[in-house]
């Protein structure tokens, strides 16, 4: 009976215990983006550093070609921050011909791709109008939440305008996930 | 063989199981900062409440002198929110001599200090230009991500301007970490 | 002795091990809010989708009547994002009679209700002045932190103005919690 002594009363026999240290985990950090062709109505995906500096992948969580590959089914916490920076948006002219402009915007989307499913699923979106008065601006969008993922799912981060992403520091723009 | 029955097939024998309830954890909340001399090009560190109200430290995670002390090596989720507030930035004059001003900014950095390493490591940064039009402004910067830390590492939160930090409520400005 | 072999040296005997897969967890997503009567100085609570699309509750974590019900005591990570959108605030008129206006604002509060305690506890608050120049604006407020909760505690998300909440997409506005 000795081997049972830590099992709580509501522990289902079929639910495996597992060491926390061997769970799939990744923290990816920004790199300078290579210019890519992308379609007008499709947000481009960022690519990431996965082993230098603060970045790592472990326990079968792999990064390949802009995607984090989910190695086992379960509930994952997924997060990303993207820092944007740009020059004054047209919007800051305040009023042209007496009427307000449509604001510019910045958007981050964390997307799940499942091979057996035709359409990607948007898991998280952070979107913000940008209508700045000063000469240049910068600001982060942070996202994070828990999702049930399946083995083989792929995660990526898409942005509305890749040229506005601040790629200068690994602590400003990042993407991560870990099995709970 | 009974004691093995919950071990999943991919469980490495050397990976210890451990109760979640005994993992190092802390949630610290804002207190009013004491008057301090600080150097021009150095972001001051915030100090925190660690036991009153919503704040706590547990399982050997200790808070001392502005630092959270990491008691064991592993992967930690670290987070902070700092709410800033201020009166109109000069930037809101919009244009001086016909050209936009350089914006003011607010920045939060979560920093790791390792005694054996000369330079602190910036783990997370949230930075935002502030160019507000109204008479006063307030806004939060939120950060959170996972990092591999070593026993003895110390974590702190630095801000660009300590006088702009909203210290009035424990739910507005906070800092926490937990072992995954 | 076999059943002990994964127990780390600092493991307290009384601390139960438990399978991660059976921990209480929930991720709720936005739905269109029904008009409700609420008192002037009280922020209205949002109600949520708990089973369709990306939303789920599991392992005795239940959602009922705007509340997430905590089924067992422990440390929980709680998070929410609310995306707000609106037309230009009056504040963008910049100066009336030579002095700036008081800014409009948007606020999210994650609140804990404990039946044995008369007053709700504000766990997390994100509050932001809104003083936009363009014709319409949109932006998210994200919150997340760890709290020690008791069995029977109830969690809700309150907002300063329910009519400004973007309910159009499940990835824009959400609320979740999971036992660590």
């Amino acid at each position: 009976l000795k081997g049972q002594e830590f099992a709580p009363s509501h522990q289902q026999v079929y639910a495996p215990l597992r060491a926390d240290g061997d769970k799939p985990r990744a923290h990816l950090t920004v790199v300078r983006q290579t210019p890519t062709q992308h379609f007008k109505n499709q947000f481009p995906a960022l690519h990431w550093e996965h082993e230098l500096g603060l970045a790592f992948t472990k326990n079968r969580m792999n990064y390949t070609n802009k995607f984090l590959l989910i190695p086992e089914s379960g509930d994952y916490f997924i997060y990303s921050q993207v820092t944007f920076r740009g020059m004054t948006s047209e919007c800051s002219e305040i009023r042209q011909a007496g009427r307000p402009n449509k604001p510019d915007s910045i958007t981050v989307v964390i997307t799940k791709v499942t091979d057996s499913y035709p359409e990607p699923t948007q898991l998280l979106m952070g979107t913000k109008s940008v209508c700045e008065v000063g000469s240049n601006w910068f600001q982060p969008i942070y996202l994070g939440a828990m999702f049930s993922l399946q083995e083989g799912d792929k995660l990526m981060v898409n942005v509305s305008d890749i040229s506005l992403v601040d790629y200068t520091k690994e602590d400003k723009t990042f993407f991560g996930a870990f099995l709970l | 063989l009974k004691g093995q029955e919950f071990a999943p097939s991919h469980q490495q024998v050397y990976a210890p199981l451990r109760a979640d309830g005994d993992k190092p954890r802390a949630h610290l909340t804002v207190v009013r900062q004491t008057p301090t001399q600080h150097f021009k090009n150095q972001f001051p560190a915030l100090h925190w409440e660690h036991e009153l109200g919503l704040a706590f430290t547990k399982n050997r995670m200790n808070y001392t002198n502005k630092f959270l002390l990491i008691p064991e090596s592993g992967d930690y989720f670290i987070y902070s929110q700092v709410t800033f507030r201020g009166m109109t930035s000069e930037c809101s004059e919009i244009r001086q001599a016909g050209r936009p001003n350089k914006p003011d900014s607010i920045t939060v950095v979560i920093t790791k200090v390792t005694d054996s390493y000369p330079e602190p490591t910036q783990l997370l940064m949230g930075t935002k230009s502030v160019c507000e039009v109204g008479s006063n402004w307030f806004q939060p910067i939120y950060l959170g991500a996972m990092f591999s830390l070593q026993e003895g590492d110390k974590l702190m939160v630095n801000v660009s301007d300590i006088s702009l930090v909203d210290y009035t409520k424990e739910d507005k400005t906070f800092f926490g970490a937990f072992l995954l | 002795l076999k059943g002990q072999e994964f127990a780390p040296s600092h493991q307290q005997v009384y601390a139960p091990l438990r399978a991660d897969g059976d921990k209480p967890r929930a991720h709720l997503t936005v739905v269109r809010q029904t008009p409700t009567q609420h008192f002037k100085n009280q922020f209205p609570a949002l109600h949520w989708e708990h089973e369709l699309g990306l939303a789920f509750t599991k392992n005795r974590m239940n959602y009922t009547n705007k509340f997430l019900l905590i089924p067992e005591s422990g440390d929980y990570f709680i998070y929410s994002q609310v995306t707000f959108r609106g037309m230009t605030s009056e504040c963008s008129e910049i100066r009336q009679a030579g002095r700036p206006n008081k800014p409009d604002s948007i606020t999210v509060v994650i609140t804990k209700v404990t039946d044995s305690y008369p007053e709700p506890t504000q766990l997390l608050m994100g509050t932001k002045s809104v003083c936009e120049v363009g014709s319409n604006w949109f932006q998210p407020i994200y919150l997340g932190a760890m709290f020690s909760l008791q069995e029977g505690d109830k969690l809700m998300v309150n907002v300063s103005d329910i009519s400004l909440v973007d309910y159009t997409k499940e990835d824009k506005t959400f609320f979740g919690a999971f036992l660590l």
Epitope: - | V31, R32, P35, H38, E49, L52, S135, S163, T168 | -
Partner: antibody, heavy 119, light 111 residues
Framework: QVQLVQSGAEVKKPGASVKVSCKAS????????INWVRQAPGQGLEWMGW????????GYAQKFQGRVTMTADRSTSTAYMELSSLRSEDTAVYYC????????????WGQGTLVTVSS | QSVLTQPPSVSGAPGQRVTISCTSS?????????VHWYQQLPGTAPKLLIE???NRPSGVPDRFSGSKSGTSASLTITGLLPEDEGDYYC??????????FGGGTKLTVLG
């Protein structure tokens, strides 16, 4: 209504200490910081420091560090300011003031306590 | 060390308008919570007149108003009354989180 009532005038010798009290009423004592401000005869106002009555945390002006101690007794809703190693230039009226949390302005003031330091 | 500078004295006849300036030696003065103004009538404790540059607490007549320009704040009193005579102080918080008071301005109502 909000009231801050201070203790009476004191005469002290150089090197001694003085402890001035400030009894609060008409509001929840632990919800607002108390500041202490002094005014030497014919001079302007000088800030000494703040006290959070809930936590007991304090913040002192550099000039008074090591000489001033601010405390609170929550059971009687009373704040105290003790100044040690008194010298003649500490002769002043000492005020307590309740702070507005959002703006840190001093909204309500005590009537003042005259402390005279003389040999 | 930051300093708030006020004119030592100003004066005006009843019904007139006077302005008292408060200039900061540092750009970070008032960045967080603004500049506040206090009135101290002879033999009494100071009273809050204006908070955060512009805002009048309830009970303060609208003859008193505050404004800001660059690193200066100003208190304007219109329709001067004899009972306005006294000392006026500006106050703020600096970047080291210390409260600062201006040196004070003595207002004399003439006649």
């Amino acid at each position: 209504q909000v009231q801050l009532v201070q203790s009476g005038a004191e005469v002290k010798k150089p090197g001694a200490s003085v402890k001035v009290s400030c009894k609060a009423s008409g509001y929840t004592f632990t919800s607002y910081d108390i500041n202490w401000v002094r005014q030497a005869p014919g001079q302007g106002l000088e800030w000494m420091g703040w006290l959070n009555p809930n936590s007991g945390y304090t913040g002192y002006a550099q000039k008074f560090q090591g000489r001033v101690t601010m405390t609170a007794d929550r059971s009687t809703s009373t704040a105290y300011m003790e100044l040690s190693s008194l010298r003649s230039e500490d002769t002043a009226v000492y005020y307590c003031a309740r702070e507005v949390p959002e703006t840190a302005a001093f909204e309500y003031w005590g009537q003042g306590t005259l402390v005279t330091v003389s040999s | 060390q930051s300093v708030l500078t006020q004119p030592p004295s100003v004066s005006g006849a009843p019904g007139q308008r006077v302005t008292i300036s408060c200039t900061s030696s540092s750009s970070d003065i008032g960045a967080g919570q603004g500049v506040h103004w206090y009135q101290q009538l002879p033999g009494t404790a100071p009273k809050l007149l204006i908070e955060g540059y512009y805002n009048r607490p309830s009970g303060v007549p609208d003859r008193f108003s505050g404004s800001k320009s660059g690193t200066s704040a100003s208190l304007t009193i219109t329709g001067l009354l004899p009972e306005d005579e006294g000392d006026y102080y500006c106050q703020s918080w600096d970047g080291t989180l210390s409260a600062l008071f201006g040196g004070g301005t003595k207002l004399t109502v003439l006649g």
